[in-house]
């Protein structure tokens, strides 16, 4: 994938990363439209959507990583998310089918924005990793537990099961991005210091 130009300003980059992760923890941009499009917007199914949200690294795991390790883990996890989103997108109804059934096209457009947004975040992760590599203080890289584990669905018995598995996955993704945002919020004012 082509990498966009990188800011050399640590604070600018960190601000962009924080803004992007804030957007990505917002369920109205991904999970909620998915729930509506798939007809899972009833109380019973919303309850089951919240269960066991996939093999995403926990906030505790993320906090235990050095900054480089954290960025590696985040990048690897987002790579898995991109694959899963591509799979989910293939199973979504087409725009003309949505129109026929009176559903909101905006919901489909929101879902289709998720992958470009993640690619933008990964670009900034790459930039931050470069910037940290050039900073004075070396930090040991700890590989994140479960960093490259794709959140695996249970074997689906039918299309309905896959919809619910998609819902659980997206719920887990939003929770993960919330944890990521909390970790970024503890990063210090310079590439050499972390607030604890």
């Amino acid at each position: 994938a082509a990498i966009g130009s990188c800011s050399k300003e640590y604070r600018v980059l960190l601000g962009q990363l924080q803004k992007q992760t804030d957007l990505m923890q917002d369920t109205s941009r991904l999970l909620d439209p998915y729930i509506r499009i798939q007809g899972l917007d009833v109380p019973k199914l919303r309850e089951h959507c919240r269960e066991r949200p996939g093999a995403f690294p926990s906030e505790e795991t993320l906090r235990g990583l050095g900054r480089r390790g954290f960025l590696q883990t985040l990048n690897a996890t987002l790579g898995c998310v991109l694959h899963r989103l591509a799979d989910l997108e293939q199973r979504l109804p087409k725009a003309q089918d949505l129109e026929r059934s009176g559903l909101n096209i905006e919901d489909l457009e929101k879902l289709q924005m998720a992958r470009p947004n993640i690619l933008g975040l990964r670009n900034n992760i790459y930039c931050m990793a470069q910037l940290l590599d050039n900073s004075d203080t070396a930090e040991p890289t700890k590989a994140g537990r479960g960093a490259s584990q794709p959140p695996t669905p249970t074997p689906a018995s039918d299309a309905f099961q896959r919809k619910l598995e998609g819902c659980r996955f997206l719920h887990g993704y939003h929770r993960f991005m919330h944890s990521v945002g909390r970790v970024f919020s503890k990063w210090g004012e310079s590439p050499n210091r972390s607030r604890r």
């Epitope: 009833v42 089951h48 269960e51």
Partner: antibody
Framework: EVQLQESGPGLVKPSQSLSLTCTVT?????????WNWIRQFPGNKLEWMGY???????SYNPSLKSRISITRDTSKNQFFLQLNSVTTEDTATYYC??????????WGQGTSVTVSS | DIVMTQTPSSLSVSAGEKVTMSCKSS????????????LAWYQQKPGQPPKLLIF???TRESGVPDRFTGSGSGTDFTLTISSVQAEDLAVYYC?????????FGAGTKLELK
């Protein structure tokens, strides 16, 4: 093929606890789905009591919330119902059932429980 | 809780007849998203557990004869048996599959004339 089988005492004294077991074969209760208890009173009224999900989370009928507990033993592929402080009103046939989220597709044969002194 | 009301409470029929039974819910069982209704129909014969016939208000469960048809939307639902067979004599229950607590109708008993 998926099968569910209820077991437990057929007679319970008032104020005591009712404990039932549902043994599942042909499907792991940790793979997916919600595993439910439903009872049918004399006169045929059906009442959903609660579930334990594949992940271990539970949900109960508010009408029973203070008295009910559903647990499981994943090593034996069993889930359990405990209903405390029973009265004669709890006399019913108790069923366990699998909910695949669209409906309850597999049911046990049911076990009859009488509450009487 | 969603209250499910079934009518009639019993039906006397002859073999080969078409029968319809009604189920009304106190709240809509419709998903606003894809317009799917979350209602199930079960058949229960004496001494047996309920058996799933219809889910999603109109989708027949695998193995259920096509003489059974579910229809309706929102709060009003119908189960139709196009040509009643002797083995269809049973009690039929509708169930709210939209919200917890799950709730059942009181049933419609199908009897022979």
């Amino acid at each position: 093929e998926v099968q569910l089988q209820e077991s437990g005492p057929g007679l319970v004294k008032p104020s005591q606890s009712l404990s039932l077991t549902c043994t599942v074969t042909g499907y792991s209760i940790t793979s997916d789905y919600a595993w439910n208890w439903i009872r049918q009173f004399p006169g045929n009224k059906l009442e959903w009591m609660g579930y334990i999900s594949y992940s271990g989370s539970t949900s109960y009928n508010p009408s029973l919330k203070s008295r009910i507990s559903i647990t499981r033993d994943t090593s034996k592929n069993q889930f359990f119902l405990q209903l405390n402080s029973v009265t004669t009103e709890d006399t019913a046939t108790y069923y366990c059932a699998r909910d695949r989220y669209e409906a309850m597709d597999y049911w046990g044969q049911g076990t009859s429980v009488t509450v009487s002194s | 809780d969603i209250v499910m009301t079934q009518t009639p409470s019993s039906l006397s029929v002859s073999a080969g007849e078409k029968v319809t039974m009604s189920c009304k819910s106190s709240q809509s069982l419709l998903s606003s998203g894809n317009q799917k209704n979350y209602l199930a129909w079960y058949q229960q014969k004496p001494g047996q557990p309920p058996k799933l016939l219809i889910f999603g208000a109109s989708t027949r469960e695998s193995g259920v004869p096509d003489r059974f048809t579910g229809s309706g939307s929102g709060t009003d639902f119908t189960l139709t048996i196009s040509s009643v067979q002797a083995e269809d004599l049973a009690v039929y229950y509708c169930q709210n599959d939209h919200s917890y607590p799950l709730t059942f109708g009181a049933g419609t008993k199908l009897e022979l004339k």
